[in-house]
């Protein structure tokens, strides 16, 4: 139909356009006419695949007409101007607006020319991460929770951890129709070594410029883990006083320290000062096993240490730790 050997006109448009739920979006569509080519455009038409009729038409004499006048608008087309820009603005994007649209130019003498554009309706999710406080269960339990709320499409959640463990991810409908809330739990066997360590939740979504990283500091509640330090096996008579320290790791923090011996209460030369036990100089050898009992909200644990104070000063001063 057109004269042979002429460069053809081309409809230019992106293959895919993203828009955000509730926002407006422009579907760009232009007619590119090669330099020597002549064309006359009489109508611009937008239609949606799978729907009957056209949603927007710009007619050379009748101007614009829309299936939903409050939601659609030709951006640049005006009566009395060359109809080369069919770009269409859509307002108040809804989930059901997602789909394939056809932009069509009715031209002479080339005939109709069209292009398809896929409109993606996105919703930017809100992301939160929180610790799941646990006790020593001896079996795998969730220790951290990462939630991406109201995304479209669903967000992709991954975890980064040096502690081992595995994710458990689920989806549920979001508050707004067509959106999805993704919940991911990080699951491992709790131990005291895990307490205070961190894991990172990584949320990826096509609405983000870069992934969002959310760090969670883990909390594992456990009864005290107790040891006694301060004795080096070289304590002697007539030396300065020395100190034993009851080292306790626990969550929550210890609420009380109780010192005793295997024989019962502390001897007179041993004075309890909270987590520390002061051993005063003695004038005769002793062989005593001290017990430190530490309590927290989850229970009590104890450690024992046998202390010998020997005769004969060392060749070099060591013995009872000087203060």
């Amino acid at each position: 139909w057109p004269p042979p050997g002429t460069g053809d006109i081309i409809v230019q448009a992106p293959t895919q356009v993203p828009g955000f739920l509730g926002d407006s979006v422009t579907l760009p569509c232009y007619l590119q006419v090669p330099g020597m080519e002549e064309t006359h455009v009489s109508q611009l038409t937008w239609s949606r695949h799978g729907e009957s009729g056209s949603m927007a038409v710009f007619h050379q004499t009748q101007g614009p007409n829309y299936s939903e006048p409050k939601r659609l608008e030709f951006v640049a087309a005006r009566l009395g101007t060359e109809l080369r820009d069919a770009s269409l603005r859509m307002f108040g994007l809804r989930v059901e607006d997602e789909g394939n649209y056809t932009c069509l130019f009715v031209t002479f003498p080339q005939g109709s020319r069209s292009v398809d554009i896929w409109l993606r309706v996105l919703a930017k999710p809100q992301n939160t991460a929180e610790v799941q406080k646990v006790q020593l269960t001896g079996k795998p339990v969730p220790v951290a929770r990462c939630v991406s709320t109201g995304g479209r499409p669903p967000a992709h959640i991954t975890w980064h951890s040096d502690l081992g463990g595995m994710p458990n991810t689920s989806q549920a409908p979001g508050f707004l129709s067509g959106t999805v809330t993704v919940t991911s739990l990080w699951i491992l066997v709790p131990s005291s070594q895990v307490d205070g360590k961190s894991v990172t939740c990584k949320v990826e979504h096509e609405s983000f410029e870069k992934p969002q990283l959310l760090t969670v500091n883990l909390t594992v509640y456990y009864p005290p883990e107790v040891s006694i330090s301060g004795y080096d096996n070289n304590w002697y008579l007539s030396q300065n006083e020395a100190t034993l320290t009851c080292d306790a790791r626990s969550n929550p923090e210890p609420t009380g320290y109780n010192w005793s011996t295997t024989m019962g209460p502390l001897p007179p030369f041993a004075v309890a000062q909270g987590a520390q036990l002061l051993i005063r100089p003695v004038d005769k050898p002793i062989n005593t096993t001290f017990i430190c009992n530490v309590t927290n909200a989850l229970g009590a644990r104890q450690a024992e240490l046998t202390v010998q104070v020997k005769e004969g000063p060392p060749s070099e001063p060591s013995g009872m730790s000087s203060n």
Partner: antibody, heavy 116, light 107 residues
Framework: EVQLVQSGSELKKPGASVKISCKTS????????MHWVRQPHGKGLEWIGG????????SYNQRFKGRVTLTVDKSTSTAYMELSSLRSEDTAVYYC?????????WGQGTLVTVSS | DIVMTQSPSAMSASVGDRVTITCKAS??????VAWYQQKPGQPPKALIY???YRYSGVPDRFTGSGSGTDFTLTISSLQAEDLAEYFC?????????FGQGTKLEIK
């Protein structure tokens, strides 16, 4: 008011040519493509072709195999259709019609009768 | 060529009736369909463009619908002045083609 006024009826012999005019007013002639459509008596409509007055660009229905020539005179805002090698089946009312994708204004029609 | 098949070819209806004329394209023409009314001894008059949009001044009892291959012209409440022949036309691709027409008579 947009008006398309066509020339009068024609009686032609087979093998002859006919040239019909379509004088326009009420709009800018060079901004709209002019097309031609014919209608044999009591029958349907058949598109012949179109021409853009500004560029001179044309498009023809291949059924007419080079028998049709469309021209314009911009100075008088007039379009012309010439049909050659006439045969009896070319007997019809010929319309000029302003093109807007569809045809929004039509001439009153010119009856061309081909008879020996 | 794209063939536009109109039905019925003729029909009779009473004033106030709802009248439906259909047009089927032999291939997809999108929404590039127009409807025309032709009264006896007159040229066609454009009613509908782009399948469903009324020309200004056309009474709203005339409604066009459809896309792809199936199109409908509906007159919601027939008036005496609607006595005419109605044609559909596709302008999706050359050569432009018309339906063979539906002659509407008033009972």
């Amino acid at each position: 008011e947009v008006q398309l006024v066509q020339s009068g009826s024609e009686l032609k012999k087979p093998g002859a040519s006919v040239k019909i005019s379509c004088k326009t007013s009420g709009y800018t002639f060079t901004e709209y493509t002019m097309h031609w459509v014919r209608q044999p008596h009591g029958k349907g409509l058949e598109w012949i072709g179109g021409i853009h007055p500004n560029s001179g660009g044309t498009s023809y229905n291949q059924r007419f195999k080079g028998r049709v020539t469309l021209t314009v005179d911009k100075s008088t805002s007039t379009a012309y259709m010439e049909l050659s090698s006439l045969r009896s089946e070319d007997t019809a009312v010929y319309y000029c019609a302003r093109w807007t994708g569809d045809f929004d204004y039509w001439g009153q029609g010119t009856l061309v009768t081909v008879s020996s | 060529d794209i063939v536009m098949t109109q039905s019925p070819s003729a029909m009779s209806a009473s004033v106030g009736d709802r009248v439906t004329i259909t047009c089927k394209a032999s291939q997809n023409v999108g929404t590039n369909v127009a409807w025309y009314q032709q009264k006896p001894g007159q040229p066609p008059k454009a009613l509908i463009y782009s399948a469903s949009y009324r020309y200004s001044g056309v009474p709203d009892r005339f409604t066009g619908s459809g896309s792809g291959t199936d199109f409908t012209l509906t007159i919601s409440s027939l008036q005496a002045e609607d006595l005419a022949e109605y044609f559909c036309q596709q302008y999706q691709s050359y050569p432009y083609t018309f339906g063979q027409g539906t002659k509407l008579e008033i009972k």
